[in-house]
Amino acid sequence: QRLPRMQEDSPLGGGSSGEDDPLGEEDLPSEEDSPREEDPPGEEDLPGEEDLPGEEDLPEVKPKSEEEGSLKLEDLPTVEAPGDPQEPQNNAHRDKEGDDQSHWRYGGDPPWPRVSPACAGRFQSPVDIRPQLAAFCPALRPLELLGFQLPPLPELRLRNNGHSVQLTLPPGLEMALGPGREYRALQLHLHWGAAGRPGSEHTVEGHRFPAEIHVVHLSTAFARVDEALGRPGGLAVLAAFLEEGPEENSAYEQLLSRLEEIAEEGSETQVPGLDISALLPSDFSRYFQYEGSLTTPPCAQGVIWTVFNQTVMLSAKQLHTLSDTLWGPGDSRLQLNFRATQPLNGRVIEASFP
């Protein structure tokens, strides 16, 4: 499936459900622990203050030790913006010492800008993508991913952080947005809706997709996530929309089949390594790109967002498993964890294809 940019592209199915994005910000590496805050239903989103869920908890990356052959990733608080006014927000709390973004949720208090002033910034994420208004940029070459195929051992940590399900990625997953724009993948997480209600963070012509995957990367110019936060291009997120298709997606099933084990907020399990690139669309050449922010507190800006034109297909059962298995704080289901779309404020979204 592809987004409807050109006439020959498949039209988007279904209209926007009207539900707004709760978890919208791209998950930062280790966004797991970041709280996401969205406006409660009925509350108007304040300009620039829309739900910016901080990316999922970002892991802190330290310089590689040759002996260990791997980087150390530590959770770094990430901020996502509050969700759409119409969408209920789930509470997600972080209890990390020294983390001033410890308490945020989708909807309700505290307003995200109070959690992190950056959430009221002018260049926030997610945004609504209008393909016909995107600027074709021939310089945007196909994305390059290296080392995303992982053997089953050692296993990877899959965690319910209260506002998303996050898979912590090992060192060595390299991604290039272009010459000299090199990154290392830190973590991936998902945003979803509820039964019959879509939950992607980004939208296309106002259409919200059932779900969205975010793979959070740290620029190789930085050794740690906290050094990169707020720096232009310091973080990059690859985002893809998840849609319903007729067949089970075997790559996603390797993760979805383990969600029952982490139904409780804060729980985690170990899953065999897998081909991470199989979770993304196969067409790395057609995408939209813009500079935005984390979609959860701290809502740091300067994040390069790359949104694939091609979508990923999951079965109806898989999408149901994603949206109906996990629990957040306070006996509430972990659902509608997306942030409302944010104003472009003059930003131009670029497209890698005409």
Epitope: G69, G147, L150, P170
Partner: antibody, heavy 119, light 110 residues
Amino acid sequence: QVQLVQSGGGLVQPGGSLRLSCAASGFPFSSYAMSWVRQAPGKGLEWVSAISANGGTTYYADSVKGRFTISRDNSKNTLYLQMNSLRAEDTAVYYCANNGNYRGAFDIWGQGTMVTVSS
Amino acid sequence: QSVLTQPPSVSGAPGQRVTISCTGSSSNIGAGYDVHWYQQLPGTAPKLLIYGNSNRPSGVPDRFSGSKSGSSASLAITGLQAEDEAHYYCQSYDRSLSWVFGGGTKLTVL
């Protein structure tokens, strides 16, 4: 220092059984996946079996599936390989190795223990 | 027969540069899985020499380097020394759910 010390090898008749042990020290054993790799006399290396850090997932080469069982006791920092229905072609030096490298490499190896299957 | 193919032997004079190739298939190296190299001196256990295609663990001299392209990989040794005489094995992961090795290459320092 980081090391893997093996024991349990020896001479066994075809159809017999043997249990190999691999004691780890100097690193957090319970956090690492482990494997067994063997080397027949004068031959190359052959991966035999692997086990996840918590012992919940195991993998076997087709040549030993159904006959060998890998296990671990994290409280004792020890890895095991139970070998049943041994055949002459199982004769080899058996190495335990740490599967901890995130890219799938074996970065720490035991000293090896010889298993001879002969009548 | 090994899943990964290596030349049985290579040789070189001290100070020279030698390379050892390792050829796989679309289910292992060609599928994107990393290649690792081990050195095995006579009568000893293998030692990790290169991991993740081109990374050296600490303590391994920079005379050793690795590279990967498509379904094959290679190990290069420059400034050959007598103590480099050993067997060298490449290793990767295969989609058949197994870790696979090459047959090994005996390096002789003339």
